[in-house]
Interface confidence: medium
């Protein structure tokens, strides 16, 4: 268990041309607030998917009224941190979405109007218990500066908040199975905390964050009875005699999500997946149009100007998500063939090909020997994306341009002497040996272990290796 903390430092116009106009005016004073959504892992989920690690809303910032003629300054921010408590282990890698909302305080009928001013998203690695990490994110012409950290709530410790410590009951020892919890010398590890929401009656755990079901129960939180033959309905009758139980009311019962949003249960409560054009914890906030600049990373916004019409972001290559907020890892599709190295340059995909292959995706197998000459009578041999020369006798090297020393490998056996020859090498054998490499002993009676020596060569003569 622990808390993710987000500190917003500034929200204002980013550097460069095209400074945004102030979101507030004398006629329409407003104030800002922020929403953070956290998801575990380096999530590629859509922006609308549940904030499985949790979400938080900031307080409202001070009321701001634009000074006529002045450029948009950094806008006044709400006090305090945004805190997202997590009950289970801190995942180490997480995805975040930080939304900047504007609350207009003019004379609206029905109270203040909310609209999304900017949304930034990212994926990060973060160990719990570490220092504050600083970040800058840009959304259109706006720039958001913030810091974040994850810290464990006692008794949890460690980079994932999974080591659970509690004060020792005695100075000398811990309880059964409770090891001393370094570096806290006076503490001991404590019982595991199961996955948040794990039924205390029907579930248990032997690892932090897990939820194992007792017999007769199922579901991720062990709240669903295993149906038996005596259960007539899918959820089972509410009768003690049948052994079937109706789970208690779920957080999504009655669907708390407005405007057609769909509800999904989370360990904490529920999460609404909102249709395009609606936001908020219960999809109660509408009014995002192309005028609000909801498309990031150069996405093209298409949609009507009235608040009720949905907008669509057409994303440039390399980005996806309903607001083009997520970079696509196009290399994960392994587009480069034949072992080519994939490089995602943002604006384009590049394949760096291995030798012997070419083409945008390294799809062409080059003729390795085309245009490759092997010198001194060598012949080119193709293979494995690289050419190789089979050199004529007396030559070596990649292209057969180097004259070889045939005697370098000491080819003559039994003390024979090697002589380089224009056509190869010649071995002068020591007495008692014969053969091209002096490899055969001469028998005492003058016969050899080989067939008779070729005509013109007596045993003991130098043998030329052709």
């Amino acid at each position: 268990a622990g808390v993710f903390e987000l500190q917003i430092h500034s929200f204002g116009p980013g550097p460069g041309p095209g400074a945004p106009r102030s979101p507030c005016s004398a006629r329409l004073p407003c104030r800002l607030f922020f929403r953070v959504c956290l998801k575990p892992g380096l999530s590629e989920e859509a922006a609308e998917s549940p904030c499985a690690l949790g979400a938080a809303l900031s307080a409202r910032g001070p009321v701001y009224t634009e000074q006529p003629g002045a450029p948009a300054p950094d806008l006044p921010l709400p006090d305090g941190l945004l805190q997202v408590p997590f009950r289970d282990a801190w995942p180490g890698t997480f995805s975040f979405i930080i939304e900047t909302w504007r609350e207009e305080l003019g004379d609206q009928i029905g109270g203040p109007a909310w609209s999304l001013l900017a949304r930034v998203a990212g994926r990060r690695r973060l160990a719990a218990g570490g220092p504050w990490a600083r970040d800058i994110q840009r959304a259109g012409a706006w720039e958001l500066r913030f810091s974040y950290r994850a810290r464990c709530e006692p008794p949890a410790v460690g980079t994932a908040c999974t080591r659970l410590c509690r004060p020792r009951s005695a100075p000398s020892r811990c309880g059964p199975g409770l090891r001393p919890c370094a570096p806290l010398e006076d503490e001991c590890e404590a019982p595991l905390v199961c996955r948040a929401g794990c039924s205390p009656e029907h579930g248990f755990c032997e690892q932090p964050g897990e939820c194992r079901c007792l017999e007769g129960w199922t579901g991720p939180l062990c709240t669903v009875p295993v149906s038996t033959s005596s259960c007539l309905s899918p959820r089972g009758p509410s009768s003690a005699t049948t052994g079937c139980l109706v789970p208690g009311p779920g957080p999504c019962d009655g669907n708390p999500c407005a405007n057609g949003g769909s509800c999904s249960e989370t360990p904490r409560s529920f999460e609404c997946t909102c249709p395009r054009g609606f936001y908020g914890l219960r999809c109660e906030v509408s009014g995002v149009t192309c005028a609000d600049g909801p498309c990031f990373n150069g996405g093209l916004c298409v949609g009507g100007a009235d608040p009720d019409s949905a907008y669509i972001c057409h994303c440039p290559p390399g980005f996806q998500g309903s607001n083009c907020e997520k970079r696509v890892d196009r290399c994960s599709l392994q587009p480069c063939r034949n072992g080519g190295l994939c490089l995602d340059l943002g604006h384009a995909l590049r394949c760096r090909c291995r030798a012997g292959f070419a083409g945008p995706r390294c799809e062409h197998d080059l003729d390795d020997c085309a245009g490759r000459a092997c010198a001194n009578g060598g012949t080119c041999v193709e293979g494995g994306g690289a050419h190789r020369c089979s050199c004529a006798l007396g030559f070596g090297g990649r292209d057969c341009r180097e004259r070889a020393d045939p005697c370098a490998a000491r080819p003559c056996a039994h003390g024979g002497r090697c002589y380089a020859h224009f056509s190869g090498l010649v071995c002068a054998c020591a007495p008692g040996y014969m053969g091209a490499r002096c490899e055969f002993p001469v028998h005492p009676d003058g016969a050899s272990a080989l067939p008779a020596a070729p005509p013109g060569l007596r045993p003991g003569d130098p043998q030329r290796y052709l």
Partner: antibody, heavy 120, light 112 residues
Framework: EVQLVESGGGLVKPGGSLKLSCAAS????????MSWVRQTPEKRLEWVAA????????YYPDTVKDRFTISRDNAKNTLYLQMSSLRSEDTALYYC?????????????WGQGTSVTVSS | NIMMTQSPSSLAVSAGEKVTMSCKSS????????????LAWYQQKPGQSPKLLIY???TRESGVPDRFTGSGSGTDFTLTISSVQAEDLAVYYC????????FGGGTKLEIK
Amino acid sequence: EVQLVESGGGLVKPGGSLKLSCAASGFTFSSYAMSWVRQTPEKRLEWVAAINSNGGNTYYPDTVKDRFTISRDNAKNTLYLQMSSLRSEDTALYYCARHRGGFYYAVDYWGQGTSVTVSS
Amino acid sequence: NIMMTQSPSSLAVSAGEKVTMSCKSSQSVLYSSNQKNYLAWYQQKPGQSPKLLIYWASTRESGVPDRFTGSGSGTDFTLTISSVQAEDLAVYYCHQYLSSRTFGGGTKLEIK
């Protein structure tokens, strides 16, 4: 129906050894932590040893540490307690008990017990 | 180890009466990370093994009559029998399972 049947108890001299067994049935034995709990002649209950579901972790109070060893054979649905260097204060009725889940859960089923008497 | 102290050590009541018995722990058995009290109550009838009545200090085990109620938090706990029946004659033990495992000395309930 959950059933736990202990065996192996008896009379043993101080310093002697004894091995208790507990045959489990009526539930998925390999899913539950198990314990041995004893009841003294004065009717006091004392926890003796525990083991997690896969046998990878064992737990003992100081009174029996290094003398008693708990183990389990999930294939045979059997829990064991090897007792050595027995003392007169180990005389008790020994119960095999099932936890509701892991170690940090209440015991929900008990066997009928097997009697161990340590006397010279 | 956490010491568990039960009181009274014995009591005698008539059938139909309400009875309460106390269990105190030398340290808190409330675990802050999940806000659970690691305390159980057991009933042991003469010649029988203990039977689980209550766990997490107040959760009644399935099949246990609803006249049995557990309450309390931290170090002070109570088992209440709202209307004692003749079959409730037993010794009642409290048990903490947070740090090691220790039992109270028991409260013997007799029926007048």
